[in-house]
């Protein structure tokens, strides 16, 4: 009996036309929501004038439905047993699951003003940019609607820059009508232990963002893992959102709608400094802001964002060093609310429920040639927003899963 089940599982998790896995893989049957909380700055003038602590108040959730589009350009390669695809991006606002509308306004860091002196560090260019910032009446902080902040707005300062650059700014701009990929993953036909593992991303086996092994694309995309998952296994996956591969370790056993699943969690040491976790040395690419690589809990992904000073962390700087959160008031990190987890059904390796939580921050530094930033006495890693992307197997699908998989094993 067990051999037959194993054989069936091995057949059904292969990523090729006709299998259970393939059908769910092409277009997820799970409804995926992405909730946003925006950090509304309460004392913008005080910060800009006196370099005070930044007082923030989170507002949310503002919920969007995401990952509802099927994978496209699916191409099997029988030679190397891979399948390639792109994942289209789309987001639909869900008013009934939100505290307000997309037109709600927030006071947030002025993304363009903060990024400009970081990208252009020489003083001639900064003097030029300063004159344009002043001319456009831009300052360190700005008021923007949710829609503008997330999906893009025409920046008045960048619109004055006298050479061709993108003048549209947004945390996720561009998003709708874009694709993530090309991904090329093993289909598992020749070796089931490699199923869904990424072979290459955008035509490359490495990212070109990090030195050494940190640059590797490891594991799957976290939607599924090779079958027969053991608690002792470290689940490795690549997240294009954070421009790196990461891992999860077994946390607990959970009953999900009658299906026994393993909850894998992102451990704190994944965000540790090289001092605490030497394996992370190659994620520290800058010595000043990181206090000589002793700070932890924030990841500088600037290289992956055209040099913009973008830092990724867990929400509310969970698992981050005190020096990171000290200049910010109003953060309340909480393990349950702010950690990331994957609930994986161990026989199939399918992720049946997940919560991906991350925070987007922007570094702003004193810039003596930029009037809007010249009074700052220290750098700040400023939280802009945090998100919670969740998906749970539907009741019908869960019943079907129990009948076809876990029921048979019992």
């Amino acid at each position: 009996g067990d051999m037959l089940i194993e054989k069936t599982i091995k057949r059904e998790v292969v990523l090729e036309e006709g299998t259970t896995a393939f059908k769910n893989w092409v277009k997820t049957g799970t409804t995926v929501y992405r909730q946003f909380w925006i950090f509304d700055v309460q004392n913008p003038d005080d910060v800009a004038k006196n370099s005070s602590k930044i007082k923030v108040k989170q507002r949310g959730p503002y919920t969007y439905r995401v990952r509802y589009l099927a994978k496209e350009n699916i191409t099997q390669d029988p030679e190397d047993h891979t399948v390639s695809f792109v994942q289209p991006n789309g987001a639909i606002f869900e008013p009934s699951l939100s505290v307000g509308t997309e037109d709600d306004n927030f006071t947030v860091l002025n993304l363009a003003v903060a990024a400009a002196p970081h990208i252009y560090q020489n003083s001639f260019v900064q003097v030029v940019l300063n004159s344009l910032i002043k001319k456009s009446k831009s300052s360190m902080f700005q008021t923007r609607s949710l829609k503008e902040l997330l999906w893009g707005y025409k920046d008045p300062f960048l619109s004055l820059v006298p050479y061709p650059i993108s003048t549209t700014v947004g945390v996720f701009y561009p998003y709708n009508d874009t694709v993530d990929g090309v991904y090329k993953v093993f289909n598992g036909k020749d070796n089931i232990s490699k199923v869904a593992i990424i072979e290459s991303y955008k035509g490359k086996r490495n990212l070109s963002y990090w030195p050494s092994y940190c640059d590797m694309i490891n594991g799957t995309d976290a939607a599924s893992f090779p079958p027969f998952v053991e608690k002792s296994r470290t689940l490795r996956f690549f997240s294009s959102d954070i421009c790196r591969s990461i891992y999860a370790v077994f946390g607990s056993e959970i009953d999900l709608k009658g299906i026994p699943v393993y909850r894998f969690v992102l451990p704190a040491n994944a965000f540790a400094s090289p001092l605490q976790n030497p394996d992370n040395h190659c994620f520290c690419t800058e010595k000043v802001i990181s206090n000589n690589c002793t700070s932890y809990g924030v990841l500088d992904i600037g290289k992956c964002k055209e040099g913009k000073p973008v830092y990724i962390s867990l929400p509310h700087f969970l698992h981050a060093s005190p020096d990171v959160s000290e200049p910010i008031e109003g953060l309340h990190p909480n393990e349950d609310e702010h950690r990331t987890y994957l609930d994986v059904e161990p026989i199939t390796g399918f992720t049946l429920q997940f919560a991906k939580r991350l925070q987007v921050n922007i570094l702003v530094k004193p810039a003596r040639k930029i009037e809007a930033l010249k009074n700052l006495k220290r750098p700040y890693i400023v939280p802009i927003l945090w998100l919670n992307e969740t998906g749970t197997i539907g009741d019908e699908k869960a019943e079907m899963f129990k009948t076809q998989v876990t029921g048979k094993i019992k």
Partner: antibody, heavy 119, light 107 residues
């Protein structure tokens, strides 16, 4: 030693055009911002135009009325100033100046080329 | 626009005397003031850059001070080779503006 050699100056009539060049002997020319500065017969120094190292960002004071265009060819290690619709008040000694490593304005200057606009 | 008022317009000093030139700006420019020397028939030469920083190779008899709107350039013991025009330049904001210059002569 940094050497900047200007050329292209001369006597022209009002309304005419002139193109100034400034050749550098520096291997690192492509990594430096550059400017044109002029000294008027009244002994006044004025910034005419500036350009960043890769030529993407240029600056002209409003007083220059967009009659001048600064450009550079990093492969030739040469800076240019295209001057059009010249007026008698453009009469001056035109210097090309290289900015310093840390962004210091006008750290090194050429010997200058004289432009005379006269009917 | 920041205007720069330089004084005096001309100065006649004897060798060994202390020379003082002043520039006042119409807006606060922190310490973004530069000082240039131009000898007859030569291009200007940067002596002191932003932050009252003496440039490499410039003799220590030259110095400057000031912050905000009031700036002073000093030659401690004047030598005959210091005969030149001296200009200040504010580089805090655009348009950059030079002072009108000070003609330093030998008494």
């Amino acid at each position: 030693e940094v050497q900047l050699v200007e050329s292209g100056g001369g006597v022209v009539q009002p309304g005419e055009s002139l193109k100034l060049s400034c050749e550098s002997n520096e291997y690192e020319f492509p990594s430096h911002d550059m400017s044109w500065v002029r000294k008027t017969p009244e002994r006044r120094l004025e910034l005419v135009a500036a350009i960043n190292s890769d030529g993407a960002i240029t600056y002209y004071p409003d007083t220059m009325e967009r009659r001048f265009i600064i450009s550079r060819d990093n492969t030739k290690k040469t800076l240019y100033l295209q001057m059009s619709s010249l007026k008698s008040e453009d009469t001056a000694m035109y210097y090309c100046a290289r900015h310093g490593q840390t962004g210091t304005w006008f750290a090194y200057w050429g010997q200058g080329t004289l432009v005379t606009v006269s009917a | 626009e920041t205007t720069v008022t330089q004084s005096p317009a001309s100065l006649s000093m004897a060798i060994g005397e202390k020379v003082t030139i002043r520039c006042i700006t119409s807006t606060d420019i922190d310490d973004d003031m530069n000082w240039y020397q131009q000898k007859p028939g030569e291009p200007p030469k940067l002596l002191i850059s932003e932050g009252n920083t003496l440039r490499p190779g410039v003799p220590s008899r030259f110095s400057s001070s000031g912050y905000g709107t009031d700036f002073v350039f000093t030659i401690e013991n004047m030598l005959s080779e210091d005969v030149a025009d001296y200009y200040c330049l504010q580089s805090d904001n655009l348009p950059l503006t030079f002072g009108a210059g000070t003609k330093l002569e030998l008494k």
